[in-house]
Amino acid sequence: EEELQVIQPDKSVSVAAGESAILHCTVTSLIPVGPIQWFRGAGPARELIYNQKEGHFPRVTTVSESTKRENMDFSISISNITPADAGTYYCVKFRKGSPDTEFKSGAGTELSVRAKPSAPVVSGPAARATPQHTVSFTCESHGFSPRDITLKWFKNGNELSDFQTNVDPVGESVSYSIHSTAKVVLTREDVHSQVICEVAHVTLQGDPLRGTANLSETIRVPPTLEVTQQPVRAENQVNVTCQVRKFYPQRLQLTWLENGNVSRTETASTVTENKDGTYNWMSWLLVNVSAHRDDVKLTCQVEHDGQPAVSKSHDLKVSAHPKEQGSNTAAENTGSNERNIY
């Protein structure tokens, strides 16, 4: 009679993580008597997956009635497959004895597990940057298999080209990770912009995964200042306004200086938002010119988002205004308003 053969018809089997994998194995003879065992890997470090004779293997079930006397089908099903289950599985026939001895092994079936990538996580720079600067964003996704994966970067729907991507590890692995760094040049209009990392993989059924970063968390748009003198409100009062325009984020402190001396400090609270996401704010100072003998240098000094202060000055000509007799006290007011002076 022809010697028993162990037939594993499938060289490879590919399943999705979470599915069950069926590993086929048949023998061509009932002789010699003895059990079948399944192993992952070969050699002394091989891992026992299933033993027909004994043991508890909760994820493994036999496809046919392996306990029947004349059964020659020893195929198994492994449930809830994970990437860690990838490897080559061998169906091995043992000859009954004390102990049982290995008689013949099948050629092996390579199980590959198709696992979805994790949701991409996009992170930006630790510190804010101003327009015209180039900042780096990173995107990471993990746990996918097979290794082939496509990663694209977008800014507001426009594909970016300045990026570098690595898939690790370089060699064979049960699962892989991708890491990509993109360079983005900031513009003043980027407060509402988004940077998107898009990952496409065969397990995603054509629906790429996306990770986003809002440039509002990255950008700092410094304000532009304009100090103007409003028409005289009363004979001896002048209204000076400081327009703080196009800044982001909102964190801003304004100080009025008269001839270098602090007159008033206030924090931007009631601001107006521009369409591009930047803010405008206005502060005003009411100066009683009769309290001044000489010309006054008024300075609007702004500290934005913890950055060094910027300032704009305005020279108030006192000589151009008639003095009110007997008045020698300063009567100054400051205020701020979204749109109107009052």
Partner: antibody
């Protein structure tokens, strides 16, 4: 058992429109990308379009110049192909096929014949 | 657009091993082209045999296997049988679209 059954084929005049359906059974449509592939009489296969599992993303053959639109109703387990501005060269048997992953045409329907002729 | 080329016809005998190939006009076929092999039998009966270069569709006999040989995708039938007589199409993925080859008519005499 996985089954794909196309319907909606027939004779249509040049410039006309037709809507093909593909009724899927034996699996949940939303878990799979689906494709339309056509075969002109005596010719080979030509890929037409893919709909992603959710239906949110579509991929179309450039040669069709936007005349064909793939869509799906996952609640009804049905795939569609809306064909507009039909031409004589669109005459073919149209097959819907399931993609096991995004890279693996595993099951095919029996096809629906579309004839464009005046 | 890329052109995918296959042998127009091949003949083999029962029990023999036969290899069908699939070439891309853009260069070497890689795993990123996700080579597919589809069988067409009379009466327009199509069966997906291989996907993603080397994954056999459940239920397809083990004698069918997919691989990359040199710069081409390949379908190997080990121990061909008379019922394997059919037309075999390969398909390759190019970033956002599939392209099918012209098909190989396999005769098993």
């Amino acid at each position: 058992e996985v089954q794909l059954l196309e319907s909606g084929g027939g004779l249509v005049q040049p410039g006309g429109s037709l809507r093909l359906s593909c009724a899927a059974s034996g699996f949940t449509l939303s878990s799979y990308a689906m494709s339309w592939v056509r075969q002109a009489p005596g010719k080979g296969l030509e890929w037409v379009s893919i709909s992603s599992g959710s239906g949110a993303n579509t991929y179309n053959a450039d040669s069709l110049k936007g005349r064909f639109t793939i869509s799906r109703d996952n609640s009804k387990n049905t795939l569609f192909l809306q064909m507009n501005s039909l031409r004589a060269e669109d005459t073919a048997v149209y097959y819907c096929a399931r993609l096991r992953f995004f890279d693996w045409f595993d099951y095919w329907g029996q096809g629906a014949l579309v004839t464009v002729s005046s | 657009q890329a052109v995918v080329t296959q042998e127009s016809a091949l003949t083999t005998s029962p029990g023999e091993t036969v290899t069908l190939t699939c070439r891309s006009s853009t260069g070497a076929v890689t795993t990123s082209n996700y080579a597919n092999w589809v069988q067409e039998k009379p009466d327009h009966l199509f069966t997906g045999l291989i996907g993603g270069t080397n994954n056999r569709t459940p239920g397809v006999p083990a004698r069918f296997s997919g691989s990359l040989i040199g710069d081409k995708a390949a379908l190997t039938i080990t121990g061909a049988q008379t019922e394997d007589e059919a037309i075999y199409f390969c398909a390759l993925w190019y970033s956002n679209h599939w392209v099918f080859g012209g098909g190989t008519k396999l005769t098993v005499l």
